[in-house]
C-alpha cells in the first residue's frame, strides 16, 4: 500500500558494512511520517535474503509495516515505532545495517539526512549499545557478581527501573541487596545465590515511550551441572524451497557436552517406536571442550523433505538438555509476510528420543553415557 497524500516519506539509507559491525545510524522522524529505511550493499553486490528486526524482535509485515528485501517502510510513524532497527542476513543473522530510530512530535523537515542534529529533538527512549545487550542468558556460579546493563538515551532523559519475573525489584528483595547505577543503566547483584535465578527486565521510559529488555539469570549451585541451553534458541524458521537455512543452539556446560542435532522422522509410517519414544535421526554430533558452545546447523538448498521437527540436544555425564524447533518449507509463492513471522519457541521434551541411523532405521542408540560420545554418528 503506497503512502497516501497526507503522508511524507523520509528516507534513510546505510551501506552494508565490511567485516566490522556497522556503526549504528541515529535517525529521527516526525510523528505521522512514513519511515523508510534502506540497506544497500556497496556496488550493488547482492546480500542474500534479509530480515528486519526492531529491538531484536523480528518484524511482521502488516498493513502499516511494509517489508522488502533491503527496504523497510513504516507508515504513519508514532512514538511506539521508535527503537533500534536492524537488517540482518536471514541465514547467518549477521547484522547488515543498524538504525536507531527516534520519532519526535513535530514532522521532520526531511533535511537532516546526516542525523547530526537529532540530539536536540524530543523523542522516545532507544538503546544506545544494542550490540552489548545480545547475551540474554547469563549462567554464573554461585557467589559471583552479576551486572545487567541497558544503556539507553532519549529526550527527556528516560528513567530506568527493574523487574524480576515481571514484578518490581528492589534491594530489600534479596539478601545482600542490589546496586542500581542509573548513570550506567545497570543493575548489580553481588554474591548471587540460587534464589536469584529468574528473568530480569529493565524498563526504560520517558513521556514519549517505553522500551524494555529481559535477561535470564541462571545461578549454578554447583559444578558439575547438566547442560543449559539459551532460551529462545534454536528458533522456528520458515524457508523458501531451495534456500539455505541456519539454526543456532547456544550450550553452556562445565563438563564436556556431547551436542547433537536431531530430526524427527517416520519409520514404516510411524513417528514413534513400539515403546512410544519418537524416532529421530542424527544429523550432526560432536563433543565440545568449551564451557560455552555456539552450535550451528546449516541446511543447504532445502526441500519439502527438510521440513519438520528438529532437536538440539546437549548431554554430559550429569544429564541432558534439549530444545525442539520447527522448519517449515514453502514454495517461492509463499507470502513474504509469512517469511517474516517470528514463531513461538518449540516445546521441550524431557524424555529420550529414539535415535536411528540411515543404515538401520530400526536400530536404537541408547542415550547417553560418555562412551557413546566417542562413537559419533554423522549423516
Amino acid at each position: 500500500e503506497p503512502p497516501g497524500p497526507e503522508q511524507r516519506v523520509v528516507r534513510r539509507a546505510a551501506e552494508v558494512p565490511g567485516p566490522e559491525p556497522s556503526q549504528q545510524e541515529q535517525v529521527a522522524f516526525g510523528s505521522g511520517d512514513t519511515v523508510e529505511l534502506s540497506c544497500h550493499p556497496p556496488g550493488g553486490a547482492p546480500t542474500g535474503p534479509t530480515v528486519w528486526a526492531k529491538d531484536g524482535t523480528g518484524l511482521v509485515a502488516s498493513h502499516r509495516i511494509l517489508v522488502g528485501p533491503q527496504r523497510l517502510q513504516v507508515l504513519n510513524a508514532s512514538h511506539e515505532d521508535a527503537g533500534v532497527y536492524s537488517c540482518q542476513h536471514r541465514l547467518t543473522r549477521r547484522v547488515l545495517c543498524h538504525f536507531s530510530v527516534r520519532v519526535t512530535d513535530a514532522p521532520s523537515s526531511g533535511d537532516d539526512e546526516d542525523g547530526e542534529d537529532v540530539a536536540e529533538d524530543t523523542g522516545a527512549p532507544y538503546w544506545t549499545r544494542p550490540e552489548r545487550m545480545d547475551k540474554k542468558l547469563l549462567a554464573v556460579p554461585a557467589a559471583n557478581t552479576v551486572r545487567f546493563r541497558c544503556p539507553a538515551a532519549g529526550n527527556p532523559t528516560p528513567s530506568i527501573s527493574w523487574l524480576k519475573n515481571g514484578k518490581e525489584f528492589r534491594g530489600e528483595h534479596r539478601i545482600g541487596g542490589i546496586k542500581l547505577r542509573h548513570q550506567q543503566w545497570s543493575l548489580v547483584m553481588e554474591s548471587v545465590v540460587p534464589s536469584d535465578r529468574g528473568n530480569y527486565t529493565c524498563v526504560v521510559e520517558n513521556k514519549f515511550g517505553s522500551i524494555r529488555q529481559t535477561y535470564t539469570l541462571d545461578v549454578l549451585e554447583r559444578s558439575p551441572h547438566r547442560p543449559i541451553l539459551q532460551a529462545g534458541l534454536p528458533a522456528n524458521q520458515t524457508a523458501i524451497l531451495g534456500s539455505d537455512v541456519e539454526f543456532h543452539c547456544k550450550v553452556y556446560s562445565d563438563a564436556q557436552p556431547h551436542i547433537q542435532w536431531l530430526k524427527h522422522v517416520e519409520v514404516n509410517g510411524s513417528k514413534v517406536g513400539p515403546d512410544g519414544t519418537p524416532y529421530v535421526t542424527v544429523l550432526k554430533s560432536w563433543i565440545s571442550e568449551n564451557v560455552e558452545a555456539d552450535a550451528r546447523l546449516r541446511l543447504a538448498n532445502v526441500s519439502e523433505r527438510d521440513g519438520g521437527e528438529y532437536l538440539c540436544r546437549a548431554t554430559n555425564f550429569i544429564g541432558v538438555a534439549e530444545k525442539a524447533f520447527w522448519l517449515r518449507v514453502h514454495g517461492p509463492q509463499a507470502a513474504e509476510e509469512e517469511l517474516m513471522e517470528t514463531d513461538e519457541a518449540g516445546s521441550v521434551y524431557a524424555g529420550e528420543q529414539k535415535l536411528i541411523s540411515e543404515e538401520d532405521l530400526g536400530g536404537e542408540q541408547k542415550l547417553i553415557s560418555e562412551e557413546d560420545l566417542h562413537h559419533h554418528h554423522h549423516h
Epitope: 554447583r222 558439575p224 524431557a350 541408547k366 553415557s369
Partner: antibody, heavy 115, light 108 residues
Framework: QVQLQESGPGLVKPSETLSLTCTVS????????WSWIRQLPGKELEWIGH???????RYNPSLQSRVTISIDTSKNQFSLKLSSVTAADTAVYYC?????????WGQGTLVTVSS | EIVLTQSPGTLSLSPGERATLSCRTS???????LAWYQQKPGQAPRLLIY???RRATGIPDRFSGSGSGTDFTLTISRLEPEDFVVYYC?????????FGQGTKLEIK
C-alpha cells in the same frame, strides 16, 4: 540440595534377588542420569550401571546378565535388582547422580549375602 | 576394560606438605574423562575433580588435577589434617567405568 537415600533389605540369601530403591529429594529426577555403584569389602569401587530419566539404561558388562535398573519419575525413585546373588555380591551399595562420574551420593547401604 | 593403577598405595606426609597422587590408565582416556574422589571412613566418596582438572563446587583450591592420555595427577598443595584419607581415580570415557584401587594418605 539434592539428597539420595537407599532402602532395602540388608541381608539376602544366596541365589535370591537383591532389591534396592533410591529416593531422590531436593530436585526432580527428570533430565538427569542416576547410577548404582558398590564398594566391595576390600574397598574396591565397582560401577554397576546407570539409568536416564526416560528409562534408558547402561550396565557393567560383567553384571549385565543379572542386573536391572528401573525408574519411577512420579515417585522420584530409581531401583536396582541383582539376581542370583552370591557371597561375592556382599558390598555397600550406593545410589548416585550421574551417568559415570557422579556428584551426589547416597550414604550407602550394606547388603550381606549369606544363608 | 580400562584398568586404573594408582600409586603409591600409601603416602606418608605431614600437614602443610604437598601431596602428589598418580593415576595411570591402561588405555588413553579421551577428552580427559577422569575424575578424582575423596573418601572418609564411614562416608560415601565425594567428587573432587572431573574432566581431569575441573574442581567440583565446594572443593578447596588446594586440590588440583592435571594430566591427559594415560597419566593423571591429583595434587594437594598444602595438606590439612582432614585430608589424610583415601583417594580414588575413575575413568568415565569408556564403559565399564572403572576405578583405581585407591591411595591412602596417612600422617607421617
Amino acid at each position: 540440595q539434592v539428597q539420595l537415600q537407599e532402602s532395602g533389605p540388608g541381608l539376602v540369601k544366596p541365589s535370591e534377588t537383591l532389591s534396592l530403591t533410591c529416593t531422590v529429594s531436593g530436585d526432580s529426577i527428570n533430565s538427569y542420569f542416576w547410577s548404582w555403584i558398590r564398594q566391595l569389602p576390600g574397598k574396591e569401587l565397582e560401577w554397576i550401571g546407570h539409568i536416564y530419566s526416560s528409562g534408558s539404561t547402561r550396565y557393567n558388562p560383567s553384571l549385565q546378565s543379572r542386573v536391572t535398573i528401573s525408574i519411577d519419575t512420579s515417585k522420584n525413585q530409581f531401583s536396582l535388582k541383582l539376581s542370583s546373588v552370591t557371597a561375592a555380591d556382599t558390598a555397600v551399595y550406593y545410589c548416585a547422580r550421574g551417568a559415570s562420574a557422579v556428584d551426589y551420593w547416597g550414604q550407602g547401604t550394606l547388603v550381606t549375602v549369606s544363608s | 576394560e580400562i584398568v586404573l593403577t594408582q600409586s603409591p598405595g600409601t603416602l606418608s606426609l605431614s600437614p602443610g606438605e604437598r601431596a602428589t597422587l598418580s593415576c595411570r590408565t591402561s588405555q588413553s582416556i579421551s577428552s580427559g574423562y577422569l575424575a578424582w574422589y575423596q573418601q572418609k571412613p564411614g562416608q560415601a566418596p565425594r567428587l573432587l575433580i572431573y574432566g581431569a582438572s575441573r574442581r567440583a563446587t565446594g572443593i578447596p583450591d588446594r586440590f588440583s588435577g592435571s594430566g591427559s592420555g594415560t597419566d593423571f595427577t591429583l595434587t594437594i598443595s598444602r595438606l590439612e589434617p582432614e585430608d589424610f584419607v583415601v583417594y580414588y581415580c575413575q575413568q568415565y570415557g569408556s564403559s565399564p567405568y572403572t576405578f583405581g584401587q585407591g591411595t591412602k594418605l596417612e600422617i607421617k
